[in-house]
């Protein structure tokens, strides 16, 4: 931002009223008036170029310094060419000297040269030659100097002529301030520019109404340079929740809009399934039946729990059931749907029912499922099972009602035994099997059926109460098809896979484990 100039002295604007001191009186500098465009123009002029040893002084009135630390002095003046005068006037000069003196009081007409300190020799960029002077085309020069730091109550400026032809049309003395500024929603007060060129005064800003420093952000600060320019902004303020930036202010969100935190973003329209918000809202309340999860951003529409899984099937496969379902028709407006599967078993004889989580095995943990199928194993035969699949989303916990679908299945068979070959010889095969422990109590006997591969006309059956059998009197180097089936009071259980086991050839005799 441009520096603000505070004028302490303006000769041109004073209309000849200042009454500066001249020394010697009347013989050197003197006030002159000229009329331009019907307006009087005043100037202090001196032109004693033909006489040697000129030492003419012009002293301003005493200027109260006030709060200024460094002053700027702008001079507008004309200087005539020494060659305008006969023989170039050997004593003629084309410069004058600028001085200042600080004091705590006005010395009035008591002028003492020795109190003055030279600021600089003032030389024109352009001199006015005779032809220009006579044609009224004077060359106006503008020079600026600065002095500081000043410490006394006031000061004088003085102009020393040593034999030039000078007209001083304007003397303007001012100091600079960094102007009052609104930036980054922070207010910076008008600040006096410092006096030392390298130094920058650090100025703290204050957030405008309804603006705050964001958490973890830096307090707003700026630096006021010597020339009255604001530099190096640090930190900023942001409009608080419920307010948005409009030009250099924070304005309350309009009805139907909201802003949930201090940020640079504007107010947002209330999302779907919310009630119209009042002015300055930080969030929009949900419509009845709709909710916002704790982690949901305020910008997200309000949502509701999902409907039940749309379609549920339970397909029994021995002592296993595969549950499959399709997503709810109404997701509630959310994508974070998960499923929970629970299991209840009922004894057909007694009609008694109870939870079965402890006795069954799921293909993956039954709570927080994201897929739409699961396999349940280790089911007991001749038992009725009811499976419940509940759909939940991020707001389900905010309501008491549940969204679920159930499917029932009766298990009439035991699970197929898992069969393995324990050993073999040229004439025998030793086979063992296993079924889940919960089903073992229901098994009366196990039936082992075997036959030569490729012979579909004859097969052999062995029954046993144990979990293994050795099949003897087999042909060497022959492949047999073996299947094991559990027998229960209610009938046959599920049969195992048909396994192919081969006896050893005569060369490799001996009972070797496979």
């Amino acid at each position: 931002a441009q520096g603000k100039e505070v004028v302490l002295l303006d000769f041109a604007a004073a209309g000849g009223e200042l009454g500066w001191l001249t020394h010697p009186y009347g013989k050197g500098w003197d006030l002159m008036q000229n009329i331009m465009n019907d307006m009087p123009i005043y100037m202090y002029s001196v032109c004693n170029v033909m006489s040697g040893d000129q030492d003419n002084w012009l002293r301003t009135n005493w200027v109260y310094r006030g709060e200024a630390e460094r002053i700027f002095i702008e001079l507008k003046f004309t200087v005539r060419d020494c060659n305008s005068f006969p023989g170039g006037a050997s004593s003629c000069k084309e410069t004058f000297n600028l001085y200042y003196a600080e004091s705590d009081l006005d010395y009035g007409t008591n002028f003492q040269k020795r109190l003055f300190t030279k600021i600089d020799t003032i030389a024109p960029d352009e001199i006015t030659v005779s032809s220009d002077f006579e044609a009224r085309h004077v060359k106006l020069n503008v020079e600026e100097r600065s002095v500081g730091p000043l410490t006394r109550k006031g000061f004088y400026l003085a102009f020393q002529d040593i034999g030039a032809c000078v007209a001083l049309l304007s003397v303007r003395v001012y100091y600079k301030k960094c102007p009052e500024l609104l930036q980054g929603l922070a207010h910076f007060p008008e600040t006096i520019a410092g006096s030392d060129a390298p130094s920058l005064a650090t100025v703290a800003g204050t957030c405008v109404d309804h603006a705050v420093v964001p958490p973890g952000g830096e307090e707003p600060r700026m630096h006021c340079a010597v020339d009255g320019e604001w530099l190096v902004p640090i930190g900023q303020c942001l409009c608080q929740a419920g307010y948005e930036k409009v030009e250099d202010a924070c304005q309350a969100c309009s009805p139907g809009f909201f802003k949930f935190e201090a940020s640079e973003s504007p107010c947002l329209e209330c999302p779907e399934h919310t009630l119209p918000s009042p002015e300055g809202a930080t969030s929009c309340e949900c419509e009845e039946g709709f909710f916002r999860a704790p982690q949901d951003p305020a910008s997200m529409p309000c949502t509701r729990p999902p409907s039940a899984p749309h379609y549920l099937t339970a397909v029994g496969m021995g002592a296993k059931v595969e549950l499959r379902w399709t997503p709810p028709q109404d997701s509630g407006g959310r994508e974070d749907i998960v499923y929970s599967v629970t299991c209840e078993q009922c004894w057909p004889e007694s009609g008694e029912c109870g939870p079965c989580e402890a006795s069954v095995r799921y293909s993956e943990p039954p709570h927080g499922l994201t897929r739409t199928s699961v396999t349940v194993s280790d089911l007991e035969p001749h038992m009725n099972y009811t499976f419940t699949v509940e759909a939940r989303n991020g707001v389900s916990g905010l309501v008491t009602s549940r969204s679920f679908r159930t499917a029932s299945v009766s298990i009439n068979q035991t699970e197929p035994p898992k069969v393995r070959l324990e050993g073999r010889s040229t004439t025998s095969l030793s086979v063992s099997w296993s079924i889940p422990p919960p089903q073992q109590s229901r098994v009366w006997k196990y039936e082992v059926t075997y036959r030569k591969k490729g012979d579909s006309n004859s097969y052999n059956v062995r029954r046993t109460e144990g979990f293994s059998v050795t099949l003897d009197d087999l042909a060497p180097d022959t492949t047999y098809l073996v299947q094991v089936q559990a027998l229960t009071q209610e009938g046959q259980g599920a049969g195992s896979k048909v396994h192919e086991f081969q006896t050893l050839s005569p060369e490799g005799s001996g009972n070797l484990a496979v």
Partner: antibody, heavy 120, light 108 residues
Framework: QVQLVQSGGGLVQPGGSLRLSCAAS????????MHWVRQAPGKGLEWVAV????????YYADSVKGRFTISRDNSKNTLYLQMNSLRAEDTAVYYC?????????????WGQGTLVTVSS | SELTQPPSVSVAPGQTVTITCQGD??????ASWYQQKPGTAPKLLIY???NRPSGVPDRFSGSSSGTSASLTITGAQAEDEADYYC????????????FGGGTKLTVL
């Protein structure tokens, strides 16, 4: 209106004294340098003396230096010229005049003039 | 330092007349011009570059060049018959201000 009214002239013997007065009205007397200009009978104008607006600075023509004293009383809006050791060549109409700007004029307001005759 | 004027100049009514003023001071400072009619105090006509106080007719004008200043009356009238004096600051430092010897203008 703006005017200067003079008084105090007359006949005086050589070596004698006379005090001329110039009463100002219609302007801020204390803001202006004031001059005395004289005109000998049938001759041109001759500058005599100047006094600054506050009375702190005074200058005289060589012909009157040491004999004449210019003064002012800003409280009475009056300019004075005390003339001592008068000579025959001091015989003239004396005018008071206001310097419109600065010390040296131009002279924009003039008194009506007062005749001083130095004769035995 | 002195300012030199012609003692007398004449002009026919309605004609233009120029009165000159010569002097070293005029290189440095502008001349002022005064009109004096018999038995009255001088009256300021022109000062500075070419400035006329209010009430002075615009037939009066001033100019300067080098060591010379001029007063020009364009369309002289009978009432312009008077003595005319130039005046300037003294650039030599000897005097504060100097007058020319005066010019008697006769309107024929």
């Amino acid at each position: 209106q703006v005017q200067l009214v003079q008084s105090g002239g007359g006949l005086v013997q050589p070596g004698g004294s006379l005090r001329l007065s110039c009463a100002a009205s219609g302007f801020t007397f204390s803001s202006y340098a004031m001059h005395w200009v004289r005109q000998a009978p049938g001759k041109g104008l001759e500058w005599v003396a100047v006094i600054s607006y506050d009375g702190s600075n005074k200058y005289y023509a060589d012909s009157v230096k040491g004999r004449f004293t210019i003064s002012r009383d800003n409280s009475k809006n009056t300019l004075y010229l005390q003339m001592n050791s008068l000579r025959a060549e001091d015989t003239a109409v004396y005018y008071c005049a206001r310097a419109s700007v600065g010390a040296t004029g131009p002279f924009d307001i003039w008194g009506q003039g007062t005749l001083v005759t130095v004769s035995s | 330092s002195e300012l030199t004027q012609p003692p007398s100049v004449s002009v026919a009514p309605g004609q233009t007349v120029t009165i000159t003023c010569q002097g070293d001071s005029l290189r440095s400072y502008y001349a002022s011009w005064y009109q004096q009619k018999p038995g009255t105090a001088p009256k300021l006509l022109i000062y500075g570059e070419n400035n006329r106080p209010s009430g002075v007719p615009d037939r009066f004008s001033g100019s300067s060049s080098g060591t010379s200043a001029s007063l020009t009356i364009t369309g002289a009238q009978a009432e312009d018959e008077a003595d005319y004096y130039c005046n300037s600051r003294d650039s030599s430092g000897t005097h504060l201000t100097v007058f020319g010897g005066g010019t008697k203008l006769t309107v024929l």
